[in-house]
C-alpha cells in the first residue's frame, strides 16, 4: 500500500496505490484511488511508467486522451470511467506481458488539488493446482498439476497426519515449457499416500502462492484449492 500526497498551492489530495501482480496473457488491473471529486470534467488521470517516454494512459474531461500514449500500450488500456467521480483511477491492462512489469505512477489532478503515488507492478504466471488420485501408479499416489507458472516455482507437499514431514524423497516434480515458451506446466507426483489423510500441494514463486488440498477416504475424494498473490495490498 502506497499513499502519496500532492501539493498545489495549499491544495493536496491523497492518492493511494496497491502493489499488484499481472498474470501473463490475461487482463490485469493496476489499482489507484483518490479523494473523490463529483465534477468529472475537472478530473485528470495520468498513468506513467518508469523508463517509458510518453504516457501509459490519460483520462480527462470525462474521456480518454491517448494522443501521447506509448505504442507498447496502444489498444491495451482503459479506466473504469463510470467510477472515476467516486475516486477510482485504476488502470485496466489487456493481455499482460512480462515486459509490463515495473514502477508506475498514478497522477491525479482535480478541482481540489494534485497528487500522485507509485505502484510496483509484477508480472508472471500463476494458476490453481488440481490434485487427482493417480490410479496408474504401482502404489497409490497423488498427481498435482498447475497449467501456467512463471518464474519457475517451488513445489512442496504436506499432510495433515504427518505434520512437518519432508516429502521430497517420495515426490517427483517436473516443469514442462508451454507452447508460448515463457510459462511452464507444473506436475508433481506424491507416492505412497495413505487413505483417510489430507494432503496439500503448495506451489510458490515470488508473485503468488497456490495450495491444493485433497482428502481421500474409502467413500469419497474431497478437493479444495486457493491462490494468493504475495506482497499485494
Amino acid at each position: 500500500l502506497i499513499i502519496g500526497f500532492g501539493i498545489s498551492g495549499k491544495h493536496f489530495i491523497t492518492v493511494t496505490t496497491f502493489t499488484s501482480a499481472g498474470n501473463i496473457g490475461e487482463d490485469g488491473t493496476l489499482s489507484c484511488t483518490f479523494e473523490p471529486d463529483i465534477k468529472l470534467n475537472g478530473i485528470v488521470i495520468q498513468w506513467l511508467k518508469e523508463g517509458i517516454k510518453g504516457l501509459v494512459h490519460e483520462f480527462k474531461e470525462g474521456k480518454d486522451d491517448l494522443s501521447q500514449q506509448h505504442e507498447m500500450f496502444r489498444g491495451r488500456t482503459a479506466v473504469f470511467a463510470d467510477q472515476v467521480v467516486v475516486g477510482n483511477a485504476s488502470l485496466r491492462l489487456k493481455n499482460v506481458q512480462l515486459t509490463d512489469a515495473g514502477t508506475y505512477t498514478c497522477y491525479i489532478r482535480t478541482s481540489k488539488g494534485k497528487g500522485n503515488a507509485n505502484l510496483e507492478y509484477k508480472t508472471g504466471a500463476f494458476s490453481m493446482p488440481e490434485i487427482n488420485v493417480d490410479y496408474n501408479a504401482s502404489s497409490e499416489s497423488l498427481r498435482c498439476e498447475a497449467p501456467r507458472w512463471f518464474p519457475q516455482p517451488t513445489v512442496a507437499w504436506a499432510s495433515q497426519v504427518d505434520q512437518g514431514a519432508n516429502f521430497s524423497e517420495v515426490s517427483n516434480t517436473s516443469f514442462e515449457l508451454n507452447s508460448e515458451n515463457v510459462t511452464m506446466k507444473v506436475v508433481s507426483v506424491l507416492y505412497n499416500v495413505t487413505i483417510n489423510n489430507t494432503y496439500s500441494c503448495m506451489i510458490e514463486n515470488d508473485i503468488a502462492k497456490a495450495t491444493g488440498d485433497i482428502k481421500v477416504t474409502d467413500s469419497e475424494v474431497k478437493r479444495r484449492s486457493q491462490l494468493q498473490l504475495l506482497n499485494s495490498g
Partner: antibody, heavy 115, light 107 residues
C-alpha cells in the same frame, strides 16, 4: 460531446430475431460500460444489462437473460443488442446509454413485433 | 432486486414554484443514484449523477440530494421547459432499477 447513434426502427414478425446497434463517437470506447434500457409504450424504463467493451464481459437483468445478447465491436466502437424469439411483449423503444459520469443516451430504436 | 419508490407519480405546479420529487430505495445504495428527464418521443436526458452531481449543460435550478435510501430532485424555480417525466435510477447493485416516474405538468 459524446454521441451515441442507434440504428433505425424495426418491424418484426413474432418468433424472429433482431440486432440493433449503437455507435459511439468522440471518446475511447473501452472505458465506459455500455448499458441498454427498454421502454415499453407509456411505461417506465427497464434496465436490460450492460456490456464492458474492454473485455466483452456482460451483466444482465435476470428478466432479459436468454432474450437479449449484448456484444461489442471495438474496431468500429459499436455496441449491439440481439433480441431473440420475439413476441409482442418485446415491443418498445430500446436505448443504449452511459449510466454514470458523462451520462449520455442514444436516440432510441423502436422495435415493433406484430403478426 | 432493489425497489425504487418514486413519488409523486404525477403533479401539477406553477411557474416559479419550487418542486421536489423523491425516490426511496428499498436498501442502502450509497450515492449510486441518477435522475433523468424525459420529454414525449425523446430519449431520457441525464440531470444528476451520483445523487448530487449536476450533468453538463443542465441548468443550475436542478439539484439533487440524499444518500443511502432517501433521495430527492429539486427544481428551485419551475420553468415551462421543465414539463416532462422524471425518473430516478439506482446503479449501486445489479439489476439496476428505475423508479416508476413522476409526470410533471404546469398548472
Amino acid at each position: 460531446q459524446v454521441q451515441l447513434q442507434q440504428s433505425g426502427a424495426e418491424l418484426m414478425k413474432p418468433g424472429a430475431s433482431v440486432k440493433i446497434s449503437c455507435k459511439a463517437s468522440d471518446y475511447s470506447f473501452t472505458s465506459y460500460y455500455m448499458h441498454w434500457v427498454k421502454q415499453s409504450h407509456g411505461k417506465s424504463l427497464e434496465w436490460v444489462g450492460y456490456v464492458d467493451p474492454f473485455n466483452g464481459g456482460t451483466s444482465y437483468n435476470q428478466k432479459f437473460k436468454g432474450k437479449a445478447t449484448l456484444t461489442v465491436d471495438k474496431s468500429s466502437s459499436t455496441a449491439y443488442m440481439h433480441l431473440s424469439s420475439l413476441t409482442s411483449e418485446d415491443s418498445g423503444v430500446y436505448y443504449c446509454a452511459f449510466i454514470a459520469g458523462f451520462a449520455n443516451w442514444g436516440q432510441g430504436t423502436l422495435v415493433t413485433v406484430s403478426a | 432486486d432493489i425497489v425504487m419508490t418514486q413519488s409523486p407519480s404525477s403533479m401539477y405546479a406553477s411557474l416559479g414554484e419550487r418542486v421536489t420529487i423523491t425516490c426511496k430505495a428499498s436498501q442502502d445504495i450509497k450515492s449510486y443514484l441518477s435522475w433523468y428527464q424525459q420529454k414525449p418521443w425523446k430519449s431520457p436526458k441525464t440531470l444528476i449523477y451520483y445523487a448530487t452531481s449536476l450533468a453538463d449543460g443542465v441548468p443550475s435550478r436542478f439539484s439533487g440530494s440524499g444518500s443511502g435510501q432517501d433521495f430527492s430532485l429539486t427544481i428551485s424555480s419551475l420553468e415551462s421547459d421543465d414539463t416532462a417525466t422524471y425518473y430516478c435510477l439506482q446503479h449501486g447493485e445489479s439489476p439496476y432499477t428505475f423508479g416508476g416516474g413522476t409526470k410533471l405538468e404546469i398548472k
